[in-house]
């Protein structure tokens, strides 16, 4: 299809090299009249379309994204080559930054329900760059966490070093839809809530004395509790003798419940003490099979191909630490009598 | 796979290390152990360092030996080598006590070609 | 210390035969004990483990049985590729005993 008569936008991601972070893209096509996606006489290829993500039409969830290739061949199905590129309903997200995802994207309905909508389509010029300038050292993360009860803040990445009065009006949306009220470099939440937690993007507008273009950045904002005062408190195995028999399999399961900690780093282990060896069984892997907003649950196995005698001499050591510190439980095996 | 190194003439009471290059698997993971074999005799074990560094000897080697172990090297150092230190020594890995991977019954599953000191004045 | 003893120190039989070696342990290790096939100028082979479990890849000619302190490899249907020394280990760690003992090695010479 002639992509001449697309709307164009102009968008840049400046990304920090220090960390992970995402970026999105909305198909920003004027608001549908009559199930309609849009007409040509509504908008002219010069005019840019207000930012409307989702549009709560059923519709507009079936948009199509391609990417225009610099050397001029044929529009390209985003979703057939780019791997680290994924469409959610309207919205495409970038999961890996880097200066390769620079380039056009052009997003169009998938149904094209009369001539006019031929037309009807997007095309935003995408520049990456990494972030060179030093100057602002401490700017907001793309990942930011609010203490649930508390009052806390959103800050735009690009924008953090700026102070309110520097800053130009940002437009603000949450989970792709346009939060109306924030204008400012910085959402103030008097009292954190976990509906607060989701998606955040925020865009301002740089100019320069040819054009200008959407400074965009994406933050993934996270509601979470204060940090855990406790050490993790096994759960299983609660017994210190465990009966068994000899020459069949057996797995020991250690659980442990580990208190939210911003900073987790949590350890769970298996040792066996023998005479005077004493060794770790790594394998196999922890896996948390409990994750909620104040704790979680991990557990790990230590599986022995068949019971022997050798085994009953020994003593299992399941040890589990964080940071505040550590809990052990030890299993002596006994045999099954008759 | 495993491979030994160092191995060469030596006078008596002059140290020496041989070291035991590992590939395939972590020294994390495993313990490794040093067997040694003089000239037309029998296998003789000499000890054992496991998975967290803790190292144990047989009775005869205790003071004599001493073994160590970076990433990928495991080292048996021959503090003061005497005439009967002459053999071929051979490290192994052990799936089973000192290793990661739990086992009922252990054994040294995988050995490598060996590496043969000779002490001689 | 744990001391293991192998006899015979040298047995010898017809391609297709049987032989059999012996180990005994001076102390109870509760089947922990492995059997390895050495050839000349090679290092020893995993044979078997755990008293009578073969290790992956080892012909079933390879038999072993035995508890407590008495021990035996059986291989029959002798090859000549069979010709080589045999040890046996005590894998039964004990803080009185040393870790990983081995017998004196029994030579098999296949006719």
């Known amino acids: 299809f002639n992509i001449s008569g697309c709307s164009t936008k102009k968008l840049l991601w400046t990304y920090s090299t220090r960390s992970e972070e995402e970026f999105v893209l909305f198909c920003d096509l004027p608001e549908p009249q009559k199930s309609h996606f849009c007409h040509r006489n509504r908008l002219s290829p010069k005019q840019v379309p207000e930012h409307l993500p989702f549009m709560g039409s059923n519709d507009l969830s079936d948009v199509q994204w391609y990417q225009q290739p610099s050397n001029g061949d044929p529009l390209e199905d985003i979703r057939k080559s780019y791997p680290h590129i994924i469409q959610d309903k309207c919205t495409l997200h970038f999961l890996t930054p880097g200066v390769n995802n620079s380039g056009s994207y052009i997003c169009r309905p998938k149904m094209i329900k009369s001539p006019y909508d031929v037309a009807c389509c997007v095309k935003m010029i995408l520049e990456v760059k990494p972030q060179t300038n030093a100057s602002c050292e401490y700017s907001a993360s793309h990942k930011q966490d609010l203490l649930l009860g508390s009052t806390g803040s959103i800050s735009c990445p690009s924008l953090s070093c700026q102070s309110d009065a520097q800053s130009p009006a940002v437009t603000w949306y949450k989970n792709g839809k346009l939060l109306s009220v924030e204008r400012s470099n910085r959402i103030v939440v008097d009292e954190v809530y976990d509906y607060h937690q989701g998606t955040y993007v925020c865009d301002y507008t740089q100019s320069d004395t040819v054009s200008s273009w959407t400074v965009r950045a994406v933050v993934q904002v996270r509601t979470i509790v204060g940090d855990t005062k406790l050490k993790p408190d096994i759960l299983d195995p609660v017994e210190d003798t465990l009966e068994v028999e000899l020459g069949k399999p057996l797995t020991i399961s250690c659980k442990a419940r580990f208190g939210f900690e911003r900073v987790f780093n949590p350890v769970i282990k298996w040792y066996i003490k023998d005479s005077d060896l004493e060794w770790e069984v790594s394998v196999p892997e922890a896996k948390s099979i409990k994750s909620t907003l104040k704790d979680e649950i991990i557990e790990r196995n230590i599986i022995l191909e068949k019971v022997t005698q050798r085994d009953l001499r020994r003593k299992f050591v399941c040890f589990v630490q964080n940071s505040i510190g550590n809990t052990t439980q030890s299993v002596q095996l006994k045999e099954k009598r008759g | 796979s495993v491979e030994e190194s160092g191995g060469r003439l030596v006078t008596p009471g002059t140290p020496l290390t041989l070291t035991c290059t590992v590939s395939?698997?972590?020294?994390?993971?495993?313990?490794m152990t040093w067997v040694r074999q003089a000239p037309g005799k029998g296998l003789e074990w000499i000890g054992i360092?496991?998975?967290?560094?803790y190292t144990y000897y047989a009775s005869w080697a205790k003071g004599r030996f001493t073994i160590s172990k970076a990433s990928t090297t495991v080292d048996l150092k021959i503090t003061s080598p005497t005439t009967e230190d002459t053999a071929t020594y051979f490290c192994?890995?052990?799936?089973?006590?000192?290793?990661?991977?739990?086992?009922?019954?252990?054994?040294?599953?995988?050995w490598g070609q060996g590496t043969l000191v000779t002490v001689s004045s | 210390a744990l001391v293991m003893t192998q006899t015979p120190s040298s047995v010898s039989a017809a391609v297709g035969g049987t032989v059999t070696i012996n180990c005994q342990a001076s102390q109870n290790i509760y089947s922990n004990l492995a059997w390895y096939q050495q050839k000349p100028g090679q290092p020893p082979k995993l044979l078997i483990y755990?008293?009578?479990d073969l290790e992956s890849g080892v012909p079933s000619r390879f038999k072993g049985s035995g508890s407590g302190t008495e021990y035996t490899l059986t291989i029959s249907d002798l090859e000549c590729d069979d010709a080589a020394t045999y040890y046996c280990q005590s894998t039964y760690y004990n803080i009185s005993a040393d870790f990983y003992a081995f017998g004196g090695g029994t030579e098999v010479v296949v006719k």
């Open positions: 192994a890995r052990v799936l089973g006590a000192g290793s990661s991977y739990y086992t009922s019954y252990d054994r040294l599953d995988l």
């Open positions: 360092i496991i998975n967290t560094g």
């Open positions: 755990g008293a009578s």
């Open positions: 395939g698997f972590s020294l994390s993971n495993y313990a």
